[in-house]
């Protein structure tokens, strides 16, 4: 992983996935039925980071099917008209308005399962998803602010003598870069792409002859990754014995 110029010794250090993000469903156990929901207008909003290319299942409030009149999913994606998917129990009818993304579907038929699935999650699925369950006692809502996460590609190379460049390419949100040991670093550069991803670039220099290997550590919501590289010799240096 990563790229290196031919005169560099580049090593992958760490690739740890944050498995809290691997979960593709926030659905509650449907047995946890709200016992006494009479006259209560329940509204729950959940911020949910989901990794791109995974599948996601979004759930409605746990309302008993016999109490339902209509289930509506309202989907608001950036730069698109609001899409609604609804199911009327009485007539067993489903209806869609302004819904063009075939990756966003009911998990099964709405009379069997009111959950919504995104299969697979794409970067364009950032947005707000709300399930509205209409019952004789009122409307029950569950909303999701879906944040699509994109794992950055990490590269490390030595651009010139004892100056290393670490890049976290096309991550969402922007990654953070740190170094071991600390070097003399230029301000971190960020390049924003039209799809919402960000490339972060850190360039550092190490003057000390005693620094052998530098490690670039990239922190991101999808997990952390580190690369390390042995620095080239100081130009003109031949022999040393603990030059520090």
């Amino acid at each position: 992983e990563g790229a290196a110029q031919s005169n560099n010794s580049l090593m992958l250090q760490t690739s740890k996935e944050n498995h809290t993000l691997a979960s593709n469903s926030l659905c509650m156990d449907e047995k946890q039925i709200t016992q006494n929901h009479s006259k209560v207008l329940a509204e729950v909003n959940i911020s949910w980071p989901v990794q791109m290319a995974r599948n996601a299942v979004l759930c409605c409030p746990p309302i008993e099917f016999r109490n339902l009149i209509v289930i509506t999913w309202e989907i608001i994606l950036r730069g698109q008209p609001s899409c609604t998917k609804s199911y009327r129990k009485e007539t067993n009818e489903t209806k869609e308005t302004n819904c063009t993304d075939e990756r966003i579907t009911w998990v099964s038929t709405p009379d069997q399962n009111s959950d919504l699935q995104i299969h697979p999650v794409a970067i364009t699925h950032d947005g707000y998803y709300r399930c509205i369950m209409a019952t004789p006692d009122g409307n029950f809502h569950r909303g999701y602010h879906l944040q699509v996460l994109v794992t950055p590609e990490v590269t490390l190379f030595e651009s010139r003598n004892r100056t290393a460049v670490c890049k976290a390419v096309a991550g969402k949100p922007a990654a953070q870069i740190s170094w071991i040991p600390a070097g003399d670093c230029a301000p971190t550069e960020q390049e924003y792409w039209g799809n919402g991803t960000v490339t972060v670039k850190s360039t550092c220099h190490w003057e000390g002859h005693n620094v052998s290997t530098v490690t670039c550590h990239v922190s991101h919501l999808t997990g952390n990754k580190s690369l390390y590289i042995e620095l080239l010799p100081v130009p003109g240096a031949k022999k040393s014995a603990k030059l520090y």
Partner: antibody, heavy 114, light 107 residues
Framework: QVQLVQSGAEVKKPGASVKVSCKAS????????MHWVRQAPGQGLEWMGN????????NYDEKFQGRVTMTADTSTSTVYMELSSLRSEDTAVYYC???????WGRGTLVTVSS | DIQMTQSPSSLSVSVGDRVTITCQAS??????LHWFQQKPGKAPKLLIS???NLESGVPSRFSGSGSGTEFTFTISSLQPEDAATYYC?????????FGQGTKLEIK
């Protein structure tokens, strides 16, 4: 796959010198630091120094300064470690390693005995 | 020089037990390190590179964690073939320095 092939065991008298070789294959020889580590019988591991074959740049640990010489022959992709003024406490297995310490040779036993 | 303090120096553990070895860098200086296993008459074998990256072909019962100055090497369920001496190596600064080793024996 990087391979490091070291020269055979040596028996030397105190005061003599020994030259251990390490031939590398499977990577760009001139682009990677080569390190030397030694291990006395029943003891831990001790870093001696390193050499960058691309430029001949060298770092020696001060403990060995003046007694150790590391060289590289780019035509044969071989590095050498020469230790002079040998004493009994230099009896050890000498290892070469590269790729930031992730690839090691099998070691060369140097015995210093009168 | 960066001194690597490795502990314990030896331990005797039963098969199936969890084993934890630590290495600490002196002077509060952040470093990066490898973990090696060495059996008598053999060259050290790299198990964990860069503090936590399991090397190819190494059983998943071995793991490494930590960053900065404090690092931990763990064997989740000790096997008979794990009897060996284990070393950490800091490779951030010259001179590279090893921990003094941990000799692991099976009860």
């Amino acid at each position: 796959q990087v391979q490091l092939v070291q020269s055979g065991a040596e028996v030397k008298k105190p005061g003599a010198s020994v030259k251990v070789s390490c031939k590398a294959s499977g990577h760009t020889f001139t682009s990677y630091w080569m390190h030397w580590v030694r291990q006395a019988p029943g003891q831990g591991l001790e870093w001696m120094g390193n050499i960058y074959p691309g430029s001949g740049s060298i770092n020696y640990d001060e403990k060995f300064q003046g007694r150790v010489t590391m060289t590289a022959d780019t035509s044969t992709s071989t590095v050498y470690m020469e230790l002079s003024s040998l004493r009994s406490e230099d009896t050890a297995v000498y290892y070469c390693l590269t790729m930031t310490g992730t690839s090691w040779g099998r070691g060369t036993l140097v015995t210093v005995s009168s | 020089d960066i001194q690597m303090t490795q502990s314990p120096s030896s331990l005797s553990v039963s098969v199936g037990d969890r084993v934890t070895i630590t290495c600490q860098a002196s002077q509060g200086t952040p470093i990066n390190l490898h973990w090696f296993q060495q059996k008598p008459g053999k060259a050290p074998k790299l198990l964990i590179s860069g503090a936590s990256n399991l090397e190819s072909g190494v059983p998943s019962r071995f793991s490494g964690s930590g960053s900065g100055t404090e690092f931990t090497f763990t064997i989740s369920s000790l096997q008979p073939e794990d009897a060996a001496t284990y070393y950490c190596l800091q490779f951030t600064y010259i001179p590279w320095t090893f921990g003094q080793g941990t000799k692991l024996e099976i009860k």
